[in-house]
Amino acid sequence: LPSCKEDEYPVGSECCPKCGPGFHVRQACGEQTGTVCEPCSPGTYIAHFNGLSKCLQCQMCDPAMGLRTSRNCSTTANALCGCSPGHFCIIQDGDHCAACRAYATSSPGQRVQKGGTESQDTLCQNCPPGTFSSNGTLEECQHGTKCSKWLVTEAGPGTSSFRWV
């Protein structure tokens, strides 16, 4: 293969000028004619100067994988996928996400220590003794009720999930 400049590509023993972003090669250059380029059709793209005979397929952001489109595909740039609301990335692919997972739900008796982000799951923590969380969505566990001195007995012991009165 010939040694071509950065903005040219090899065709046989010759070098042809590349097509620009958003175009692919319709006809390679020849003795008399330059490179004839053709725009990428909708749903395809090429981001760089190139000697490709076909444009690349835009990636689809599959909701079943917890993905949503964060940047639409254009003829010069691929679509970018992000996580749907309530999801975080579990497979990073360069500057975008290939798969997401729904945030973990804190159980009753736990609090949300740190809310989920695009890249991190929700962090749950057990409620400390004497506190409770009935649904696992609270950032702080609540203190259990203390019986007043006028009440002789508690109806039952409290747990981290339930409050007895």
Epitope: G20, Q32, T33, G34, T35, C37
Partner: antibody, heavy 117, light 108 residues
Framework: EVQLLESGGGLVQPGGSLRLSCAAS????????MHWVRQAPGKGLEWVSS????????DYADSVKGRFTISRDNSKNTLYLQMNSLRAEDTAVYYC??????????WGQGTLVTVSS | EIVLTQSPGTLSLSPGERATLSCRAS??????LAWYQQKPGQAPRLLIY???NRASGIPDRFSGSGSGTDFTLTISRLEPEDFAVYYC??????????FGQGTKVEIK
Amino acid sequence: EVQLLESGGGLVQPGGSLRLSCAASEFTFSSYAMHWVRQAPGKGLEWVSSITSASSYIDYADSVKGRFTISRDNSKNTLYLQMNSLRAEDTAVYYCARGTRGLFDHWGQGTLVTVSS
Amino acid sequence: EIVLTQSPGTLSLSPGERATLSCRASRSVGKYLAWYQQKPGQAPRLLIYLGSNRASGIPDRFSGSGSGTDFTLTISRLEPEDFAVYYCQQYGSSPPITFGQGTKVEIK
């Protein structure tokens, strides 16, 4: 000798339409790609559109895409340019040119299109 | 798109002098560059193609050179009819086909 004769130019209001024609003679019209090139008053040359010999491929400059339509009738040896939604910046002399290997080897004398209210 | 930059914008010379016109491309166009001459009120005329090939009927005082990104049109001895505007045009990677902004060769 190759001859190309443009017609159809004139004064039109912004948003209006015009259809340019280019009558070709003295060569086998159906064997050549054809082009439209324009030149605004006092300015340089700007490629507008191209069509291959059998109309298989058509290309437009971004500035006219979606507004202009190039076509040809090989039985009449005529090239056309339908111009819609005309703007002031489309004011120019419009040349039709015969294409050979990406070159413009013969040109017509041009027709003036003026877009003004 | 490939941008072509011509220099100088205007060249003031006398008949019999040598004219050197430059055309620089923003990226490689290979050898696929043409030169045209345009006189006032007239259509452009093809002078040079493939960087250095003279078109049919063009006098040999016109010559072209260069490849890749840098091209030159030389008129060895200016004749009175050579005073005009000259445009370069690339067809190395198209569409779009692009032209330089032109160089005016005027009488000094």
